[in-house]
C-alpha cells in the first residue's frame, strides 16, 4: 500500500522515493517526508530557511498530536503555550504567562495569585495559627526563684503559612511582665560555690529591678541590711500596686 502511494506520487514530484527513512511512507529529496507510516505524526522541521517533513512517534515540545482518519500530524500549541494537550488546553505556558485552567494568562484572575515558581495561578492562602498555649511560669533568667518581677510567655503554632498575597501571620509568641512572691532559690538552683557573692549580686539585681520599675533614676551603691531591704521592698510593693491599678498589665508581643 505504501509502495503504491510512493509510486503514484512520482507523477507529481519527480524526486519521490519509496526507500524513505524515519517512518516516512513517501518522501522526496526536496520536501523530506510527504506522508507518514500509520501511527506516526507528520511535522515540519525547520532547517535554516527550509522546512522538511519528518515523521515522529510523538510530537515535539510546543506541538500536540492530532489524529484524523489515516492521517496524523503535529499541530502547534497556541502562541503563548509551551506544552499542550490540545489546541484549547495548555499544560505549560511560555515565559511570562501563568497557567490557569488550561489557558495562559499574562496576569491571574481576581481571587487568584501568580506562583512564580510553578508559573500557575493559584488560590490565595491566608495564614492560619493555632490557639495560644497556656502562659508559662513566671521566670527570670531561666529561673522561677530569687526574684519578684519576671516574665511569662505563651506561644502558638503556624498551621498554614500564607501565600504571597495572603494575610500575614500574627505573632507566634507573646511575653508579659509578672510579679510573684519572692522565694529563695534552693541549694540546687543556686549552686554550691560563692553563695554569698551570688546573694549580694541578687540583692543588687533586685534593687536595679525595683528602682527601674518605680522610675527611680539612680541606683544605691551601698549594701543594705536585711531590715532596710525589707522595709524598702514594702514601700516599692505599695508603689507598684498603685501603678498596676492604673496600668492593668504590660504586654509585649514578639514575632518569631
Amino acid at each position: 500500500q505504501n509502495a503504491s502511494r510512493g509510486r503514484r506520487q512520482r507523477r507529481m514530484h519527480p524526486n519521490v522515493s519509496q526507500g524513505c527513512q524515519g517512518g516516512c511512507a513517501t518522501c522526496s529529496d526536496y520536501n523530506g517526508c510527504l506522508s507518514c507510516k500509520p501511527r506516526l505524526f507528520f511535522v515540519l522541521e525547520r532547517i535554516g530557511m527550509k522546512q522538511i517533513g519528518v515523521c515522529l512517534s510523538s510530537c515535539p515540545s510546543g506541538y500536540y498530536g492530532t489524529r484524523y482518519p489515516d492521517i496524523n500530524k503535529c499541530t502547534k500549541c497556541k502562541v503563548d503555550c509551551d506544552t499542550c494537550f490540545n489546541k484549547n488546553f495548555c499544560t505549560k505556558c511560555k515565559s511570562g504567562f501563568y497557567l490557569h485552567l488550561g489557558k495562559c494568562l499574562d496576569s491571574c484572575p481576581e481571587g487568584l495569585e501568580a506562583n512564580n515558581h510553578t508559573m500557575e495561578c493559584v488560590s490565595i492562602v491566608h495564614c492560619e495559627a493555632s490557639e495560644w498555649s497556656p502562659w508559662s511560669p513566671c521566670m527570670k533568667k531561666g529561673k522561677t526563684c530569687g526574684f519578684k518581677r519576671g516574665t511569662e510567655t505563651r506561644v502558638r503554632d503556624i498551621l498554614q503559612h500564607p501565600s504571597a498575597k495572603g494575610n500575614l501571620c500574627p505573632p507566634t509568641s507573646e511575653t508579659r511582665t509578672c510579679i510573684v512572691q519572692r522565694k529563695k532559690c534552693s541549694k540546687g538552683e543556686r549552686g554550691k560555690k560563692g553563695r554569698e557573692r551570688k546573694r549580694k549580686k541578687l540583692n543588687k539585681e533586685e534593687r536595679k529591678e525595683t528602682s527601674s520599675s518605680s522610675d527611680s533614676k539612680g541606683l544605691e551603691s551601698s549594701i543594705e541590711t536585711p531590715d532596710q531591704q525589707e522595709n524598702k521592698e514594702r514601700q516599692q510593693q505599695q508603689k507598684r500596686r498603685a501603678r498596676d491599678k492604673q496600668q492593668k498589665s504590660v504586654s509585649v508581643s514578639t514575632v518569631h
Partner: antibody, heavy 119, light 107 residues
Framework: EVQLQESGPSLVKPSQTLSLTCSVT????????WNWIRKFPGNKFEYMGY???????YQNPSLKSRISITRDTSKNQYHLQLNSVTTEDTATYYC?????????????WGQGTLVTVSA | DIVLTQSPSSMYASLGERVTITCKAS??????LSWFQQKPGKSPKTLIY???RLVDGVPSRFSGSGSGQDYSLTISSLEYEDMGIYYC?????????FGAGTKLEIK
C-alpha cells in the same frame, strides 16, 4: 496524469438525497486521500470531507449528520451522499485529491458539477 | 474553525505589474497554507503549497511567503493569463477552510 470526473444529477428536490460519484483515472483510490469540496454561488468554498486510502472517512462536523462518503475500489470511484438537502445546498461540487501533508493539497481537481436544489 | 481573511477582495492591475494578495488566519497555521487560482468555468488549479512551494509546472513568477497567521501570494510580473480568482486554503487542521477569494482583473 491523474484525472477526476464528477457525475450525478444536476437537479435535486428539497428534502431528497444528493448523490455524486467521482471517477478516478491515473491513480488508485487505495493510495492518497480523496475529497469532496463545494463552491456556493458567490464563490464561497466549503470543505466537505475525505475518504482515505484504507476507506476511513472524515466529514466536516457542520455536515456530519447528513453526509456520507463511500468508495468502490473495483471501479476506482468514490461517492458523496448528502441527505435532506435544502436550497442552501445548491453549489458546484468538486472532487479533489491530496497525498499527505508534505505534498500539494488538492494537486488534482475534477472539473466540478453544478447541483441545483429546487422544487 | 479557522477563519482566513483575504485581501483585497478584488483588484485591477496592469500587465507587468507586481501584484500581492494577502491572507490572514485567525490563528497560527504553521505554514500549512496553499494558494489556488480559478478561472471562470474552469476547475481550480493549485499554485503553491506549504506557504512557498511551487507546484510542478507553475510559472516561477508566482511566489508565496509568510508564517504564523500572515501569508501572501506575489505575482512578480503580471501576465494576461493570470486573471482569475485567487484563494488561500489552510490545512493545519480539519475542517480545512478557504479564504473568500481575490478577483484579479487586468487594467
Amino acid at each position: 496524469e491523474v484525472q477526476l470526473q464528477e457525475s450525478g444529477p444536476s437537479l435535486v428536490k428539497p428534502s431528497q438525497t444528493l448523490s455524486l460519484t467521482c471517477s478516478v483515472t491515473g491513480d488508485s483510490i487505495t493510495s492518497g486521500y480523496w475529497n469532496w469540496i463545494r463552491k456556493f454561488p458567490g464563490n464561497k468554498f466549503e470543505y466537505m470531507g475525505y475518504i482515505s486510502y484504507s476507506g476511513k472517512t472524515y466529514q466536516n462536523p457542520s455536515l456530519k449528520s447528513r453526509i456520507s462518503i463511500t468508495r468502490d475500489t473495483s471501479k476506482n470511484q468514490y461517492h458523496l451522499q448528502l441527505n435532506s438537502v435544502t436550497t442552501e445546498d445548491t453549489a458546484t461540487y468538486y472532487c479533489a485529491t491530496y497525498y499527505g501533508y508534505g505534498g500539494p493539497w488538492f494537486a488534482y481537481w475534477g472539473q466540478g458539477t453544478l447541483v441545483t436544489v429546487s422544487a | 474553525d479557522i477563519v482566513l481573511t483575504q485581501s483585497p477582495s478584488s483588484m485591477y492591475a496592469s500587465l507587468g505589474e507586481r501584484v500581492t494578495i494577502t491572507c490572514k488566519a485567525s490563528q497560527d497555521i504553521d505554514s500549512y497554507l496553499s494558494w489556488f487560482q480559478q478561472k471562470p468555468g474552469k476547475s481550480p488549479k493549485t499554485l503553491i503549497y506549504l506557504t512557498n512551494r511551487l507546484v510542478d509546472g507553475v510559472p516561477s513568477r508566482f511566489s508565496g511567503s509568510g508564517s504564523g497567521q500572515d501569508y501572501s501570494l506575489t505575482i512578480s510580473s503580471l501576465e494576461y493569463e493570470d486573471m482569475g480568482i485567487y484563494y488561500c486554503l489552510h490545512y493545519d487542521e480539519f475542517p480545512l477552510t478557504f479564504g473568500a477569494g481575490t478577483k484579479l482583473e487586468i487594467k
